[in-house]
Structure formats: structure tokens, C-alpha cells
């Protein structure tokens, strides 16, 4: 072992007699790095890539195999090799992957499988980016695949990137796929979901659209309130504040149905807090929940502010801020 050549000498070393690899098999795991470099033909490796994944090469041996492929394909690996990279994929840098042209969903799946159970790495992100750009849009099959491996994938895209998602792809989205989406992303996804589910009947439609409602405008919430949907508080709390504010007490009551009692527990949190401050006290009293608004209130103690709702809203909002 002491006579092992230095890395710089590796390419100059000749393969020892009788060690030339005729095929990629298990015997190669006992080859030292310089022996792999000298005795394994890169073209043989490329044609038998499918075998590499079944052989327990060490990390250091995988480095040598990658180096051989890099020399054989300096402009980037062909898809026939990429599809069979297996664990060698984990050795690739984003720079390596940017040279690839991956068009097959099967290739994408094979590589995602290697990284399964781990966070999305820069390599995987680059691979997906290359694949989606190559396809021109995020079609349903691709989205199906990506969200199966990475439930949070959709929420990692910018609003601009999401705009390339066709409405038909929305059918592949599960509620958990939207857990980490912010309002800007839901603003883009909601109209697509509305379009995708438009032919469904009321109750089925609500089940599908529910997780996208963080992007819904006021008029759509008003329409939903007429359909006995019984929205839960968790969904209500994710609605856009600007979409909730114009809703009347009667509309919110219809929208939430039996869940309306949950407003009391959320009265200090947006959007409930801001909505309460916009309502007449008389209207809020009809809910029987003890919610304290600021406008048109016969219970209200700040008479001097009663008709100046703007100032009053500010005052009450500050009062609640201080309490939190």
C-alpha cells in the first residue's frame, strides 16, 4: 500500500498484468484507486453503468469512476448514462448537471429515487430545473413525480415559475404540497385551481379548492358563503386579509357554518382581528360570541370616536397590539 502512486501520477500508471477489467463486476471493489483508473476502460464503464449501482464501491472509488466518465464526456453525459448513474449521481455537482440534457421522466425518477428521504440538494434542484426547462412547462406527470418525492416542491418555485404550471397539472397537487406556500404563490395557483376544478359540483369543488383558498379574492369567498361549505378555522386563518375584510358578519357566518364559534379563539390574530375591527358591534353581537368591534356600537365606550371609523380602527388596532 505504501507504494500507491500519488493522485497526479494516477494517469501515468499502467494497469498491472491480468488486472484489466473485462466487465464491471464485484471484483473491482478490491482495486485501489489507481488500479481502477488504469484498468477500467471508460467506454466499458459507460456501457455497463447499470451494474455500478449494484456494486458496493466506496466513496473514493466512485470518485475515480466519475472522473473516467468526465473524461469520456467532457460536454456532459448522454441520457443513456445519466439514467443509470444511481448513487454516482450524489457525486455530481450542479455544474456537472447543467451540462446534461434530461428529457425522460424515467431518468428523472431514477435519479430522484437515489436522493429519496433526504432534503432537496442543490444537485436535485439543478436537475429538476434542467428537466422542467427542457419540457417548457411543468406538466401533470412531472408535477406528480416531483411532489411525490418532494411534497414542498411547488412552494419552492417563484410566482414567475409557477405561472408556467398548466391548470391541468393542479389535479396532481395534494393539500400537503401547499403547506409552505406563501400568499404570493397561492395568488398564482388559485386561479389555475379554480379553472381546473370548475366543472365539479359544490361540495366536491370545495374539497379540492380548499387548500388553494389563500389566493382567493373577496368575490369568490362571497360566492362560497352561499354554498354551505362549512370552512374550518385553519383554512379561514390562511385567507388573504384584504379578501376577508369586505365580508359581512352574515357572510362569514355562512362561510364558517358551525365553525363560526372558533372566531372567539382567534380574535387577536389576523385576519380575524382586522375583520372584527371593520364590523358594526350590533352585527357582531348577532353571533353571540362576545366579539368586541368598534363601529356603530351601543356597547362602545369611546363615543368620541364612534363616527370616525378610521381613527377608531387605528386606536383599537393599537390597543390590541399592546395586549398581545
Amino acid at each position: 500500500d505504501a507504494a500507491q502512486p500519488a493522485a497526479s501520477e494516477v494517469e501515468k500508471t499502467a494497469c498491472p498484468s491480468g488486472k484489466k477489467a473485462r466487465e464491471i463486476d464485484e471484483s473491482l471493489i478490491f482495486y485501489k484507486k489507481w488500479e481502477l483508473e488504469a484498468c477500467v476502460d471508460a467506454a466499458l464503464l459507460a456501457t455497463q453503468m447499470d451494474r455500478v449501482n449494484a456494486i458496493p464501491f466506496t466513496y473514493e472509488q466512485l470518485d475515480v469512476l466519475k472522473h473516467k466518465l468526465d473524461e469520456l464526456y467532457p460536454q456532459g453525459y448522454p441520457e443513456s448514462v445519466i439514467q443509470h448513474l444511481g448513487y454516482l449521481f450524489l457525486k455530481m455537482s450542479p455544474e456537472d448537471i447543467r451540462k446534461w440534457n434530461v428529457t425522460s421522466l424515467e431518468t428523472l425518477k431514477a435519479l430522484l429515487e437515489v436522493n429519496k428521504g433526504h432534503e432537496m440538494s442543490p444537485q436535485v434542484a439543478t436537475l429538476i430545473d434542467r428537466f422542467v426547462k427542457g419540457r417548457g412547462q411543468l406538466d401533470k406527470d412531472t408535477l406528480d413525480t416531483l411532489t411525490a418525492f418532494y411534497p414542498g416542491y411547488l412552494c419552492s418555485l417563484s410566482p414567475e415559475e409557477l405561472s408556467s404550471v398548466p391548470p391541468s397539472s393542479i389535479w396532481a397537487v395534494r393539500p400537503q404540497d401547499l403547506d409552505t406556500c406563501d400568499p404570493r404563490q397561492l395568488d398564482v395557483l388559485y386561479p389555475k385551481a379554480r379553472l381546473a376544478f370548475q366543472n365539479m359540483n359544490g361540495s366536491e369543488y370545495f374539497v379540492k379548492i380548499q387548500s388553494f383558498l389563500g389566493g382567493a379574492p373577496t368575490e369568490d369567498l362571497k360566492a362560497l358563503s352561499q354554498q354551505n361549505v362549512s370552512m374550518d378555522l385553519a383554512t379561514f386563518m390562511k385567507l388573504r386579509t384584504d379578501a376577508v375584510l369586505p365580508l359581512t358578519v352574515a357572510e362569514v357566518q355562512k362561510l364558517l357554518g358551525p365553525h363560526v364559534e372558533g372566531l372567539k379563539a382567534e380574535e387577536r390574530h389576523r385576519p380575524v382581528r382586522d375583520w372584527i375591527l371593520r364590523q358594526r358591534q350590533d352585527d357582531l353581537d348577532t353571533l353571540g360570541l362576545g366579539l368586541q368591534g368598534t363601529r356603530g356600537s351601543h356597547h362602545h365606550h369611546h363615543h368620541e370616536f364612534r363616527h370616525d371609523s378610521g381613527l377608531n380602527d387605528i386606536f383599537e388596532a393599537q390597543k390590541i397590539e399592546w395586549h398581545e
Epitope: 464485484e26 449494484a54 458496493p56 464501491f57 466506496t58 466513496y59 473514493e60 450524489l90 437515489v114
Partner: antibody
Framework: QVQLVQSWAEVKKPGASVKVSCKAS????????MHWVRQAPGQGLEWMGI????????SYAQKFQGRVTMTRDTSTSTVYMELSNLRSEDTAVYYC?????????????WGQGTLVTVSS | DIQLTQSPSTLSASVGDRVTITCRAS??????LAWYQQKPGKAPKLLIY???SLESGVPSRFSGSGSGTEFTLTISSLQPDDFATYYC?????????FGGGTRLEIK
């Protein structure tokens, strides 16, 4: 939870063979390599070889080449290690040990061990 | 084959002590080293992999360091449960090899 359960202790005569089993549970059997490591009484650990449960391919340490055979049965998630032409110095505790496919080389779970005694 | 030499072979220490065990490789193994703890009559248990990564469920008083040919396992404050034999193991190249072990005993 991950478990590797090995067969009971064995007493063998020199020249005989022994076959030790290791039944895996609590994980996807074909997603991890399985190794065999032995430990003679009061001694250190010695790696014997590796099997890929997915395809059944094997690699053995040179010291055991020709005497050891590792096999697997995917239907029962069990791997086997057979050592032939036993001699007294083969008396040891034999362990199966799992390693992640992606790193191959360290062992995150071990069987409880099987004592093989070779004595005339 | 890559030889691993552990030192000391036996170490006497008391509860609460900070102890360090060393493992030297006969050639560079980068960071491809694991540490195990073994108690009498039991299978080894993985403590550290990739020289310094703590295995899930292992107390944080255990830590590993080093790369190339010199590695150490440190136990920051010995607990009664820590008295055992410790082995290092390289997985840089085949055959996989282990150090001779360090027996940690109560002083």
C-alpha cells in the same frame, strides 16, 4: 424498528460447514447492503464480506475466498453466511451488520451475534 | 490493506473524566472512519461515522474528529454506562478494517 435476528449458537467439528442466518425486519431489505463480521474470543473485529440483497451479488475478503458463501432470500428478508472446511481458529462470534447502500462501509445496525464453536 | 492502530489499548478513567482515544491509519482515508462501542457479550454499536458525524440517538458527550491518518474519539464527561471497548473502522477502501480496540475501564 430495525432488527437483525441471527440463528442460535452452533458447535461444529473441524472440516465441517456451518450456515448462519440473519433475518432482517423494520426496513426495506433490498435497500441496504449486508456484511458479515466475526470476532474471535477476546479478539478484535474482522470483516468477512458483503452481499447486496437486491441482486444477490457478493464480495469476500481474500482471507475467506473459497470457504465462505453469502446468499439471501428476499421472500423472508434473510441473509445467510456459510463457512466451510472449519478449523479451530474459526471459533468466533459471527455478526451480520447492515450498511447504507450509499456509503457501503460503516454499520448502523448489527445482529446479536452467533457463536460458532469448532472443536473435535 | 489499510491498518488501523488504536491507542491506548487500555484506558483507566473515572466518572466525569474527559477521555480521548486515538486511531491512526496506515495511509490517508480522508474522513471515511467510524467509531463503535462494544460491551461484553453484545454486538458493537455505531457512535460516529464520517469521522465526526454523530449517529442518531447517541449522547452528545461523544464526539469524533480528524481526517487523513489521525482520528480521535472524545467522551467529554464519562458516565458509568460508557465503560466498554471502543473500535475504529475505516471504509475508505476494501477490505474494510478495524482497529484493535481500546478497553475503557473504571479507575
Amino acid at each position: 424498528q430495525v432488527q437483525l435476528v441471527q440463528s442460535w449458537a452452533e458447535v461444529k467439528k473441524p472440516g465441517a460447514s456451518v450456515k448462519v442466518s440473519c433475518k432482517a425486519s423494520g426496513y426495506t431489505f433490498t435497500s441496504y447492503y449486508m456484511h458479515w463480521v466475526r470476532q474471535a474470543p477476546g479478539q478484535g473485529l474482522e470483516w468477512m464480506g458483503i452481499i447486496n440483497p437486491s441482486g444477490g451479488s457478493t464480495s469476500y475478503a481474500q482471507k475467506f475466498q473459497g470457504r465462505v458463501t453469502m446468499t439471501r432470500d428476499t421472500s423472508t428478508s434473510t441473509v445467510y453466511m456459510e463457512l466451510s472446511n472449519l478449523r479451530s481458529e474459526d471459533t468466533a462470534v459471527y455478526y451480520c451488520a447492515r450498511s447504507p447502500r450509499v456509503t457501503t462501509g460503516y454499520f448502523d445496525y448489527w445482529g446479536q451475534g452467533t457463536l460458532v464453536t469448532v472443536s473435535s | 490493506d489499510i491498518q488501523l492502530t488504536q491507542s491506548p489499548s487500555t484506558l483507566s478513567a473515572s466518572v466525569g473524566d474527559r477521555v480521548t482515544i486515538t486511531c491512526r491509519a496506515s495511509q490517508s482515508i480522508s474522513s471515511w472512519l467510524a467509531w463503535y462501542q462494544q460491551k461484553p457479550g453484545k454486538a458493537p454499536k455505531l457512535l460516529i461515522y464520517k469521522a465526526s458525524s454523530l449517529e442518531s440517538g447517541v449522547p452528545s458527550r461523544f464526539s469524533g474528529s480528524g481526517s487523513g491518518t489521525e482520528f480521535t474519539l472524545t467522551i467529554s464527561s464519562l458516565q458509568p454506562d460508557d465503560f466498554a471497548t471502543y473500535y475504529c473502522q475505516q471504509y475508505s477502501s476494501y477490505p474494510l478494517t478495524f482497529g484493535g480496540g481500546t478497553r475503557l475501564e473504571i479507575k
